[in-house]
């Protein structure tokens, strides 16, 4: 157990010019700060709860806004921000500091809050060390602060996991040694035998493993047998070394939220961690005064410890403390493979090539709404579109006049004539076919099946229009 402490030194415009004034000139204001601690160094920290704890500063002195003047360093609240932690100090953590402005005008619903700046930094810090100073930029603002983590006795060490006894103690309990005369505070517990149960064993000398009542074995992992023990709950038998563990009031630990249980005559008592109270530590002691709502959430109720608070979250956030960002893109509003972007104030779709529209719903390559001019027809395929144009027209949309004879379609010297229903080839002597592609044998017999009845070699060959499409 221990306390993380944060001292804000200054908050104001950074070097290189004053930021755009955040002041609204609607009346007096004051600053306050929120600190949020999260374990580890994850980039995802901003979207997770403040698992190590959070705290809210007092309000700073009231100041009057001056929109035209450059923003000076703003007046700060007095005192430290303190975040108690119950378990081990993790060493690596994410530190989030929010600077809030409270407008004290006559707004409906009380003072208006607005977030001026938020800095998020991942840090390594050993408990018990000196104050660490830092300067961080948030946009054009600059925040100067110091922080440290300190253990609360009997916990000591860089992670607050070692326990100690005051030097005045004449005798130590399980796992604790008297403090050495020359040691500043206390001495670490001895190293027990390897494998000695952390829950049921302890040692007073290095390398030993002594068992708590009800447990036995070289590593204190074996519950004592009930067959040859005393029938009453009481001290361990000197002959068998075992104990009949009757149904004690602390069995199963009835204390919630990390509370520790101690037996009282005929009952139990829970020692609750900070922030919880009640017979079983089941009631949260957090009130709206503690600022439990993150990301601009509005706290309602909770004026005293006996009433709960409710956080009304702003758009884009959820959770009992508004600590979770709503993944509005999870509904997959963008079609055709578009990328959903959450801009905070709105969602936007970034479309793949070939698609458009607010939700990428328009396929720029399909035939929907695509007119092919001059009697052309739209043909879809392969994620693209093309116009199959009527005779005499070409281009992407069949808007260009096309000369059907421009490609010299008549073979072997045949002459091409444009015709309203298609092109016509007049073949040179000795050739026949729609494009004059077939030679005529000297005996007048075609090398291919005979010409249709009534068609003599040398007659013009009409090229039906349905064979002639310009594809672009």
């Amino acid at each position: 157990a221990g306390v993380f402490e944060l001292q804000i030194h200054s908050f104001g415009p950074g070097p290189g010019g004053a930021p755009r004034s955040p002041y609204s000139a609607r009346g007096p204001c004051r600053l306050f700060f929120r600190v949020c601690l999260k374990p580890g160094l994850s980039e995802e920290a901003a979207e997770s709860p403040c698992a190590l704890g959070a705290a809210l500063s007092a309000r700073g002195p009231v100041y009057t806004e001056q929109p035209e003047a450059p923003a000076p360093d703003l007046p700060l609240p007095n005192g430290l921000l303190q975040v108690p932690f119950r378990d081990a100090w993790p060493g690596t953590f994410s530190l989030i500091i929010e600077t809030w402005r409270e407008e004290l005008g006559d707004q409906i619903g009380g003072p208006a809050w607005s977030l001026l700046a938020r800095v998020t930094r991942r840090r390594r810090l050993a408990a018990g060390g000196p104050w660490a100073g830092d300067i961080q930029r948030a946009g054009a603002w600059e925040l100067r602060f110091s922080y440290r983590a300190r253990c609360e006795l009997p916990a000591v060490g860089t992670a607050c996991t070692r326990l100690c006894r005051p030097r005045s103690a004449s005798r130590c309990g399980p796992g604790l040694r008297p403090c050495a005369p020359l040691e500043d505070e206390c001495e670490a517990p001895p190293v027990c035998r390897a494998g000695c149960s952390l829950e049921h064993g302890f040692c007073e000398q290095p390398g030993e493993c002594r068992c708590l009542e009800g447990w036995t074995g070289p590593l204190c992992m074996v519950p004592v047998s009930t067959s040859s023990c005393l029938g009453l709950r009481g001290p361990s038998s000197t002959t068998t070394g075992c104990l009949v563990p009757g149904p004690g009031p602390c069995d199963g630990n009835p204390c919630a939220n990390g509370g520790s249980c101690s037996e009282t005559p005929g009952s139990f008592e829970c020692t609750c961690p900070r922030g919880f109270y009640g017979l079983r530590c089941e009631v949260s002691g957090v009130t709206c005064a503690d600022g439990p709502c993150f990301n601009g959430g509005l706290c309602v109720g909770g004026a005293d410890p006996d009433s709960a608070y409710i956080c009304h979250c702003p758009p884009g956030f959820q959770g009992s403390n508004c600590e979770k960002r709503v993944d509005r893109c999870s509904l997959q509003p963008c079609r055709n493979g578009g990328l959903c972007l959450d801009l905070g104030h709105a969602l936007r779709c970034r479309c793949r090539a070939g698609f458009a529209g607010p939700r990428c719903e328009h396929d720029l390559n399909d035939c929907a709404g695509r007119a092919c001019a001059n009697g052309g027809t739209c043909v879809e395929g392969g994620g693209a579109h093309r116009c199959s144009c009527a005779l005499g027209f070409g281009g992407r949309d069949c808007r260009e006049r096309a000369d059907p004879c421009a490609a010299r379609p008549c073979a072997h010297g045949g002459r091409c004539y444009a015709h309203f229903s298609g092109l016509v080839c007049a073949c040179a002597p000795g050739y026949m076919g729609a494009r004059c592609e077939f030679p005529v044998h000297p005996d007048g017999v075609s090398a291919l099946p005979a010409a249709p009845p009534g068609l003599r070699p040398g007659d013009p060959q009409r090229y039906p229009h349905h064979h002639h499409h310009h594809h672009h």
């Epitope: 980039e43 959450d342 801009l343 905070g344």
Partner: antibody
Framework: QLQLQESGPGLVKPSETLSLTCTVS??????????WGWIRQPPGKGLEWIGS???????YHNPSLKSRVSISVDTSKNQFSLRLSSVTAADTAVYYC?????????????WGQGTLVTVSS | AIQMTQSPSSLSASVGDRVTITCRAS??????LGWYQQKPGKAPELLIY???SLQSGVPSRFSGSGSGTDFTLTISSLQPEDFATYYC?????????FGPGTKVDIK
């Protein structure tokens, strides 16, 4: 401080496959707030976006290169990779990897220092 | 694909000058445009995002404006370290496309 570092061979033969890896340090590649992109710059010329990948594997490519481009991600190693097949001299460039923020406002805020890949026999 | 054009392609200026670079998109891109500075042998660095938002740590002499198809990067008072090539990037639609660049050198 986030850092990106490109690595891979500096010389590739024509018609072969160019392979590069970008290693991300100082931050997690598995964040939901970022895409991870590849951009290239031929000597003396401008910048061209190649493609981007999300930690879950969702990919966007530049259609001008799509048939030749493959981008993959390895979250366990905090890396993402680029493969460009059938390379020609026109693929000679400095290749950069970069992080693109996709929440709030979109932009490439962190870049690797770049690695020159020459395509030559 | 959305085409981006920049003008001028190069310019010569002196320390203390006010410099303006323009970027034009072939279709409307709202304000989804960034400006990047690149020095020889270095990776590009973000200056402005969302057309007008100054990236943290970038000097306030840099500013951006515009929306739709026409955008401007302004350096209010050119400093020696500002001689570089500047690129605009549209991130409105895929494929993301850069402008051809504007080289700012010493007069």
């Amino acid at each position: 401080q986030l850092q990106l570092q490109e690595s891979g061979p500096g010389l590739v033969k024509p018609s072969e496959t160019l392979s590069l890896t970008c290693t991300v340090s100082g931050g997690s590649i598995s964040s939901s707030s970022y895409y991870w992109g590849w951009i290239r710059q031929p000597p003396g010329k401008g910048l061209e976006w190649i493609g981007s990948i999300y930690y879950s594997g969702n990919i966007y490519h530049n259609p001008s290169l799509k048939s030749r481009v493959s981008i993959s991600v390895d979250t366990s190693k905090n890396q993402f990779s680029l493969r460009l097949s059938s390379v020609t001299a026109a693929d000679t460039a400095v290749y950069y990897c970069a992080r693109e923020i996709i929440v709030g406002a979109t932009h490439f805020d962190y870049w690797g220092q770049g690695t020159l890949v020459t395509v030559s026999s | 694909a959305i085409q981006m054009t920049q003008s001028p392609s190069s310019l010569s200026a002196s320390v203390g000058d006010r410099v303006t670079i323009t970027c034009r998109a072939s279709q409307g891109i709202r304000n989804d445009l960034g400006w990047y500075q690149q020095k020889p042998g270095k990776a590009p660095e973000l200056l402005i995002y969302a057309a007008s938002s100054l990236q943290s740590g970038v000097p306030s002499r840099f500013s951006g404006s515009g929306s739709g198809t026409d955008f401007t990067l302004t350096i209010s008072s050119l400093q020696p370290e500002d001689f570089a090539t500047y690129y605009c990037l549209q991130d409105y639609n895929y494929p993301l496309t850069f402008g051809p660049g504007t080289k700012v050198d010493i007069k």
